[in-house]
């Protein structure tokens, strides 16, 4: 058993049928010695008396808010949560496996630049009685500071019969140098509590590996005289690291017809313009990627050919 | 990524082309190592990220773009001093800091070159003959060093008398390649920045 926060405790259980569970001793936070009784949740049934209460915690029915009283007055509370270990592996019931970029990916994180700011998100089908708490650091043995905000519900989607909820959090490394060569990964730890179930999820990454630039901005077409060709131009996104001559991007320009089956013409360039043939009803899209370290491509910025 | 490669203008900063080749070569070598050594811990998540140039050179700090010198987090100690006379310094704009930067890059390349050559000698003794260093990568390191053209004492190639542990050597190869790729990215950024300025 360990303390998650004041008066909230996590009991770690080897989770299998007929498991013996864990013996837990609760102590009433009071100078009183006599006349103390214990109850669980809203029940008035007295579980025991005395300054300490010894319980055998086996299942969720044994978890909850234990309260010690004296003469009708509440003295203190202890909330017991359960953390299930199933055959040597901590349970992952609360969050959905996003399966991208690989199986058992519960937290996904992205950064728009090298400033040390990043966003993480996760999915669940649970809509109520759910709380998250996020901590982060650079390295784990001698951790350096990363400050995270509160996790917020950022999207709701319908997936078949189920509703899916997306939560996200923004974090910022306290003293980040955009040009630094990372040797220690960022660690992100999310505590999730659903009713009386506790779970924790972690992700470890280098900022360089989660970079995904914003799409190029100010995408414009300029027709070339006496030609079906157009000059496409764009600019670096505002959120990208500066100077751009140091943090350079490379671009992919795509001409896509109305039909998804039509052949796509693609050009790769390091410049912020390109000359392409604009077909009728086609659209031109441009996306960006770090020129020197191949992390994710940005989403496409698009304009119609007409 | 197999993308069309632009050839640099003749007037371009002479080292840019070499640094682009270096990044391409080390990235290819790392990809080859990860595929060949699939049963070894060779991915970024599995290896320890060591930097053989730590406390010996200070490339990131010496080559910091002017725009980032206002960022206190970027200004670690710059204690290392280097010899300055290099042929990449083709323009009158060359400052002491630029010379320091380029000579730090040269020192990095020299250190990695020695490590890679020593390691290749060990790998050639492996009866499994599983993996060797790409000669193209070694040649590209050499070309960039020549383009930088700094006078510096030659570091003797390390020779070891004990029987090599090939498992450890292959893991060290992965560690070195990951670190060198990160340094090659920094070198490419620096060359691109110097070329633009």
């Amino acid at each position: 058993i360990w303390e998650l926060k004041k008066d909230v405790y996590v009991v770690e259980l080897d989770w299998y049928p007929d498991a013996p569970g864990e013996m837990v001793v609760l102590t009433c936070d009071t100078p009183e010695e006599d006349g103390i009784t214990w109850t669980l949740d809203q029940s008035s049934e007295v579980l025991g008396s005395g300054k300490t209460l010894t319980i055998q915690v086996k299942e969720f029915g044994d978890a909850g808010q234990y309260t010690c009283h004296k003469g009708g007055e509440v003295l203190s509370h202890s909330l017991l949560l359960l953390h299930k270990k199933e055959d040597g592996i901590w349970s992952t019931d609360i969050l959905k496996d996003q399966k991208e970029p690989k199986n058992k990916t519960f937290l996904r994180c992205e950064a728009k630049n090298y400033s040390g700011r990043f966003t993480c998100w996760w999915l669940t089908t649970i809509s109520t009685d759910l709380t998250f708490s996020v901590k982060s650091s650079r390295g784990s043995s001698d951790p350096q500071g990363v400050t995270c905000g509160a996790a917020t519900l950022s999207a709701e989607r319908v997936r078949g019969d189920n509703k899916e909820y997306e939560y996200s959090v923004e974090c910022q490394e306290d003293s980040a140098c955009p040009a630094a060569e990372e040797s220690l990964p960022i660690e992100v730890m999310v505590d999730a509590v659903h009713k009386l179930k506790y779970e924790n999820y972690t992700s470890s990454f280098f900022i360089r590996d989660i970079i995904k630039p914003d799409p190029p901005k100010n995408l414009q077409l300029k027709p070339l005289k006496n030609s079906r060709q157009v000059e496409v131009s764009w600019e670096y996104p505002d959120t990208w690291s500066t100077p751009h001559s140091y943090f350079s991007l490379t671009f992919c320009v795509q001409v896509q017809g109305k039909s998804k089956r039509e052949k796509k013409d693609r050009v790769f360039t390091d410049k912020t313009s390109a000359t392409v043939i604009c077909r009728k009803n086609a659209s031109i899209s441009v996306r960006a990627q770090d020129r020197y370290y191949s992390s994710s491509w940005s989403e496409w910025a698009s304009v119609p050919c007409s | 990524r197999n993308l069309p490669v632009a050839t640099p203008d003749p007037g371009m900063f002479p080292c840019l082309h070499h640094s682009q080749n270096l990044l391409r070569a080390v990235s290819n070598m790392l990809q080859k190592a990860r595929q060949t050594l699939e049963f070894y811990p060779c991915t970024s998540e599995e290896i320890d990220h060591e930097d053989i140039t730590k406390d010996k050179t200070s490339t990131v700090e010496a080559c910091l773009p002017l725009e980032l010198t206002k960022n206190e987090s970027c200004l670690n100690s710059r204690e290392t001093s280097f010899i300055t006379n290099g042929s990449c310094l083709a323009s009158r704009k060359t400052s002491f800091m630029m010379a320091l930067c380029l000579s730090s890059i040269y020192e990095d390349l020299k250190m990695y070159q020695v490590e890679f050559k020593t390691m290749n000698a060990k790998l050639l003794m492996d009866p499994k003959r599983q993996i060797f260093l790409d000669q193209n990568m070694l040649a590209v390191i050499d070309e960039l060093m020549q383009a930088l053209n700094f006078n510096s004492e030659t570091v003797p190639q390390k020779s070891s008398l004990e029987e090599p542990d090939f498992y450890k050597t292959k893991i060290k190869l992965c560690i070195l390649l990951h670190a060198f790729r990160i340094r090659a990215v920094t070198i490419d950024r620096v060359m691109s920045y110097l070329n633009a300025s």
Epitope: Y16, E86, G88, D93 | -
Partner: antibody, heavy 115, light 112 residues
Framework: QVQLVQSGGGVVQPGRSLRLSCAAS????????MHWVRQAPGKGLEWVAF????????YYADSVKGRFTISRDNSKNTLYLQMKSLRAEDTAVYYC????????WGQGTMVTVSS | SYVLTQPPSVSGTPGQRVTISCSGG????????VKWYQQLPGTAPKLLIY???QRPSGVPDRFSGSKSGTSASLAITGVQAEDEADYYC????????????FGTGTKVTVLG
């Protein structure tokens, strides 16, 4: 004490269907994940499928994906394996089993796919 | 499709020490714990070892398990006639959990 009693095995022709059941008692069935494991005659153990405690997630071996469906009825304390498009290579003893560091196995039920 | 490799058979005389190996990889045994089962003819498997080296109550102490790197082993010190059975190791792969990964199985024969 924990008990898993299996039923539903038998002889079936290729291409036909069969449903296996596993009745649980002696524990809170709705709190634990469950597996199906099979063993072809004279061969080793092969995992078939898993279902979460609440039925929210199901996992299958590639060899049965799209043909077998694992399900559970927590109100009846029963686990099921619906097997469709049966093939000769599905002939085996099928076991249900609890998920956890200490596990309990059913007695096994024989499924024979033969024309 | 077995990822965990065991020797097909091992044998020993009563009282001898018999060991069975189970060889896997970084993503299974290297990452997760190992279990060992004993299966007597015509019966369901019985758990002998869980968590690499833990014995459930009721399992004789002549059975012991260990794990090192990407391999595990089961030792029977002072093998007895009633130990003649098939033995299976089991683990999980970090990418496909909760799918059970079983070893190929080892037939233990107790001679004469």
């Amino acid at each position: 004490q924990v008990q898993l009693v299996q039923s539903g095995g038998g002889v079936v022709q290729p291409g036909r269907s069969l449903r296996l059941s596993c009745a649980a008692s002696g524990f809170t069935f709705s709190s634990y994940g469950m597996h199906w494991v099979r063993q072809a005659p004279g061969k080793g153990l092969e995992w078939v499928a898993f279902i979460r405690y609440d039925g929210s997630n199901k996992y299958y071996a590639d060899s049965v994906k799209g043909r077998f469906t694992i399900s559970r009825d927590n109100s009846k304390n029963t686990l099921y394996l619906q097997m469709k498009s049966l093939r000769a290579e599905d002939t085996a003893v099928y076991y249900c089993k609890t998920h956890g560091s200490h596990d309990n196995w059913g007695q096994g039920t024989m499924v024979t796919v033969s024309s | 499709s077995y990822v965990l490799t065991q020797p097909p058979s091992v044998s020993g005389t009563p009282g001898q020490r018999v060991t069975i190996s189970c060889s896997g990889g970084r993503s299974n045994i290297g990452y997760n714990t190992v279990k060992w089962y004993q299966q007597l003819p015509g019966t369901a498997p019985k758990l002998l070892i869980y968590g690499n080296d833990q014995r459930p109550s009721g399992v004789p102490d002549r059975f012991s398990g260990s794990k090192s790197g990407t391999s595990a082993s089961l030792a029977i010190t002072g093998v007895q006639a009633e130990d003649e059975a098939d033995y299976y190791c089991q683990s999980y792969d970090r990418g496909t959990h909760p799918a059970l990964l079983f070893g190929t199985g080892t037939k233990v024969t107790v001679l004469g």
